[in-house]
């Protein structure tokens, strides 16, 4: 369906409001350091141009591709060279190389100030004074900090953000109404960004085939009553949507996502019985709802897999005829029968099956060779089951904060070269998996836990990629999409690591810690814990616990003291000495 003007086509499909929002997100994800006002100006210029193309698709430049139009616009930014350095060199390239160049310069961990939440009254006043600017600012701030945030989903977050302010700024107790909603949006937003980050990393590092395999497994679990052909169609469409969003083609992505939601709802009878409620919602809510919909019930009396994939003499013939289709069918059949498995486990099983067929179909007696392939699955299934059982027991025993600390110690010992903020951020997230997943019954634990772990370990990979410091991290991050988590789990203490010099400054604290939120105070303590392990990697659990207990008592005491700063100075010196003695430094 070729259109004379791509920009006019997307403007008409999406409507002005969504068009402007998506262009703002696209620009903020590319030029992450530019001030808000500059982006708004660029967006307004693009919007005015789009309107001229809607009026006359043959008008000058209206036939240009979106990449050309947007790239030209970004390259008009006067301060490009001084703000972004070598990114400015992208502007010397032609499309599609120019867009690829911009994509390569997206920064997953941009050097931007932490977002500080103003007082509720200040926010409500700003919301009432200029609602449109207030909401655009939200899109801009999230997009520039999360350059791979799933754009159509960000529109959904913005809609909820607006609804929260609309409701709560009229409430008797504005703060009680608004703050929990904002906390929820922040936490969900971080999780959504991390999930999309994994999808984009999969596409970029491992290619379309790997992403499609992931999608077959996930959609087959979710829609076990759907035919293989139906699942294949959904996978193809979903892959296109995510390829576009990860590639910066946000208008196409949002448009295609809307089309996919429409198709799913029009065909829900042949897809899933769980879609009814989702399909009654407006577009943004509908798409979100479909993405989160619970698994449909498995069809009754599904036959054993063995007949078609092990028992049949035609296995090698079917495999040779269309390898990816046959493997896709295997994955579909296995996944729809196993909503209790994580997607990455299903992919490991499919990979094992593929490797076996590659070897056996070239053997003298193929059937004899692949007959026992399902036996090879047993250890692959048991490994995550045991890991989750052990870690959930530890989580239940310790609670979230202390469980995070156990993971901090574990991961710092595995990869001590990684920066302390990265280790803290990733371990805190890994620890939250306990709270999220361990409460589930056995049948739901693995898909929850292992797929969550994959998302957060990808975060470690992405942050590490920016400044690689550990060969072990690089190895676990690049060898395989599905074996990342087992690779990290298998790492032992890094015996080659030379402990960091002890620096008392790292363990010097001031009265400002007393005014921090509980979460921020935890992060301070966890930062100190990582540094301790980096100084003394062979420290025992008991030694570290003793030091952390001392630290907690020190903070508690000095925050209650009349002269806090003096207490922090005097007790701080003794804390350092006591810690050094406890750790034998």
């Amino acid at each position: 369906d070729a259109h004379k003007s791509e920009v006019a086509h997307r403007f008409k499909d999406l409507g002005e409001e969504n068009f402007k929002a998506l262009v703002l997100i696209a620009f903020a994800q590319y030029l992450q350091q530019c001030p808000f006002e500059d982006h708004v100006k660029l967006v307004n210029e693009v919007t005015e141009f789009a309107k001229t193309c809607v009026a006359d698709e043959s008008a000058e430049n209206c036939d240009k591709s979106l990449h050309t139009l947007f790239g030209d616009k970004l390259c008009t930014v006067a301060t490009l060279r001084e703000t972004y350095g070598e990114m400015a060199d992208c502007c010397a390239k032609q499309e599609p190389e120019r867009n690829e160049c911009f994509l390569q310069h997206k920064d997953d961990n941009p050097n931007l100030p932490r977002l500080v939440r103003p007082e509720v009254d200040v926010m409500c006043t700003a919301f009432h004074d200029n609602e449109e600017t207030f909401l655009k600012k939200y899109l801009y701030e999230i997009a520039r900090r999360h350059p791979y945030f799933y754009a159509p989903e960000l529109l959904f977050f913005a809609k909820r953000y607006k609804a929260a302010f609309t409701e709560c700024c009229q409430a008797a107790d504005k703060a009680a109404c608004l703050l929990p909603k904002l906390d929820e949006l922040r936490d969900e937003g971080k999780a959504s960004s991390a999930k999309q980050g994994l999808k984009c990393a999969s596409l970029q590092k491992f290619g379309e085939r790997a992403f499609k395999a992931w999608a077959v497994a996930r959609l087959s679990q979710r829609f076990p009553k759907a035919e293989f052909a139906e699942v294949s169609k959904l996978v193809t469409d979903l892959t296109k949507v995510h390829t576009e969003c990860c590639h910066g083609d946000l208008l196409e992505c949002a448009d295609d996502r809307a089309d996919l939601a429409k198709y799913i709802c029009e065909n829900q009878d042949s897809i899933s019985s769980k879609l009814k409620e989702c399909c009654e919602k407006p577009l943004l809510e509908k798409s979100h709802c479909i993405a989160e919909v619970e698994n449909d019930e498995m069809p009754a009396d599904l036959p054993s897999l063995a007949a078609d994939f092990v028992g049949s003499k035609d296995v090698c013939k079917n495999y040779a005829e269309a390898k990816d289709v046959f493997l896709g069918m295997f994955l579909y059949e296995y996944a729809r029968r196993h909503p209790d498995y994580s997607v990455v486990l299903l992919l490991r099983l499919a990979k094992t099956y593929e490797t076996t067929l590659e070897k056996c179909c070239a053997a003298a007696d193929p059937h004899e060779c692949y007959a026992k392939v399902f036996d090879e699955f047993k250890p692959l299934v048991e490994e995550p089951q045991n890991l989750i059982k052990q870690n959930c027991e530890l989580f239940e025993q310790l609670g979230e904060y202390k469980f995070q600390n156990a993971l901090l110690v574990r991961y710092t010992k595995k990869v001590p070269q990684v920066s302390t903020p990265t280790l803290v951020e990733v371990s805190r997230n890994l620890g939250k998996v306990g709270s999220k997943c361990c409460k589930h019954p056995e049948a739901k634990r693995m898909p929850c836990a292992e797929d969550c772990l994959s998302v957060f370990l990808n975060q470690l990979c992405v942050l590490h990629e920016k400044t690689p410091v550990s060969d072990r991290v690089t190895k676990c991050c690049t060898e395989s999409l599905v074996n990342g988590r087992p690779c990290f789990s298998a790492l032992e203490v890094d015996e080659t690591y030379v402990p960091k010099e002890f620096n008392a400054e790292t363990f010097t604290f001031h009265a400002d810690i007393c005014t921090l939120s509980e979460k921020e105070r935890q992060i301070k303590k966890q930062t100190a814990l990582v540094e301790l392990v980096k100084h003394k990697p062979k420290a025992t659990k008991e030694q570290l616990k003793a030091v952390m207990d001392d630290f907690a008592a020190f903070v508690e005491k000095c925050c209650k003291a009349d002269d806090k700063e003096t207490c922090f100075a005097e007790e701080g010196k003794k804390l350092v000495a006591a810690s050094q003695a406890a750790l034998g430094l």
Epitope: D549, A553, K557, K574, L575
Partner: nanobody
Framework: EVQLVESGGGLVQPGRSLRLSCAAS????????MHWVRQAPGKGLEWVSG????????TYADSVKGRFTISRDNAKNSLYLQMNSLRAEDTALYYC????????????????WGRGTLVTVSS
């Protein structure tokens, strides 16, 4: 106001045991290391033992090592000194003392003293 009240002293025969207690009030007990200090008749002060805020770190004077045991119960705001194999030279007034710090490192800082409890070891 900080109060430290010792109890448990008395007359005891050599080789026997005694347990001293110190009840603390007027401050957050678990925010401080605690000590026992003694003064024998006509002599100067002698530090006996110290215990960190949570009992993780304990130190003793050589003269009492292996015979005396210091402990604390933060829930009861109490400090204890278990004295075994008592000798005539252990005769002294025993003071419960609060440190200024949580920790037992370097030289102790004796900030608040109790009134003392007398221990007499004699046959």
């Amino acid at each position: 106001e900080v109060q430290l009240v010792e109890s448990g002293g008395g007359l005891v025969q050599p080789g026997r045991s005694l347990r001293l207690s110190c009840a603390a009030s007027g401050f957050t007990f678990h925010h401080y290391a605690m000590h026992w200090v003694r003064q024998a008749p006509g002599k100067g002060l002698e530090w006996v033992s110290g215990i960190s805020w949570n009992g993780n770190k304990i130190t003793y004077a050589d003269s009492v090592k292996g015979r005396f045991t210091i402990s604390r119960d933060n829930a009861k705001n109490s400090l204890y000194l278990q004295m075994n194999s008592l000798r005539a030279e252990d005769t002294a007034l025993y003071y419960c003392v609060r440190d200024s710090s949580l920790f037992i490192v370097g030289a102790p800082t004796f900030e608040h003293w109790g009134r003392g409890t007398l221990v007499t070891v004699s046959s």
